[in-house]
Interface confidence: low
């Protein structure tokens, strides 16, 4: 049975050129995480797998950082940049957690989380 | 145990340099990433920089081109060189394990002024 939950960010905005961390933790569950995929819509941004270490998608790589944590770090945001971003949590023998975080980037030079690079 | 001592901070004149080493011990240091963060005074830790095992870097907009990252797997110790440094870039620098970032070190004072 499938007791973890996933904490996410949740909804978070950031301005155009800036940085942002997306960050989900797993919590609630004894299971062994074995891979954490972050995705972009349909797009693999990054791995990172707890044998191998991290894996950036070489599309990405010049523009995201692995963490910290298992979280992940984007940077010179572009308003392209908006949208769904999903934290796959692979575990065992639990299965697939996956989080939700929705990214805005702004044009003005106030965003609503403004705080960038912060460690909760 | 698993243990990261950093090293190397001091007072320094804006436009000067330093570097930073941290020491890993109790863990396969080349199995992680490694990353520097730092806490201004009054200021919440922040992201500086972040070296992967294979080589690859990333930094903070704010020290992109000043500040260099980089890893001896042989030594277990990852270093930041740190150039053209400004008033603002005082803080107690943090190395961290990069994988859960469950282990810190004690911190290094950088202070940069004239």
């Known amino acids: 049975m499938m007791t973890g939950t996933i904490e996410t960010t949740g909804n978070i905005s950031a301005e155009k050129g800036g940085s942002i961390i997306l960050q989900c933790h797993l919590s609630s569950t004894t299971a062994q995480v074995t891979q954490v995929n972050w995705e972009q819509q349909d797009q693999l941004l990054a791995i990172c797998n707890a044998d191998l270490g991290w894996h950036i998608s070489p599309s990405f790589k010049d523009r995201v950082a692995p963490g910290p944590g298992l979280g992940l770090t984007l940077q010179s945001l572009t308003v392209n940049d908006t949208g769904e971003y999903f934290c796959i949590y692979h575990t065992y023998p639990d299965g697939t957690y996956t989080g939700r975080i929705f990214l805005e980037v702004l044009e003005s030079s106030v965003a609503e989380h403004g705080a960038r690079f912060q460690i909760p | 145990e698993v243990q990261l001592v950093e090293s190397g901070g001091g007072l320094v004149q804006p436009g000067g340099s330093l570097r930073l080493s941290c020491a890993a011990s109790?863990?396969?240091?080349?199995?992680?990433?490694m990353g520097w963060f730092r806490q201004a005074p009054g200021k919440e830790r922040e992201w500086v920089a972040s070296?992967?095992?294979?080589?690859?870097?990333w930094y903070a907009d704010s020290v992109k081109g000043r500040f260099t990252i980089s890893a001896d797997n042989s030594k277990n110790t990852a270093y930041l060189q740190m150039n053209s440094l400004k008033p603002e870039d005082t803080a107690v620098y943090y190395c961290?394990?990069?994988?859960?970032?469950?282990?810190w070190g004690q911190g290094t004072l950088v202070t940069v002024s004239s």
């Open positions: 961290a394990r990069g994988d859960s970032m469950d282990v």
């Open positions: 109790g863990f396969v240091f080349s199995s992680d990433w």
């Open positions: 070296v992967l095992r294979g080589g690859y870097t």
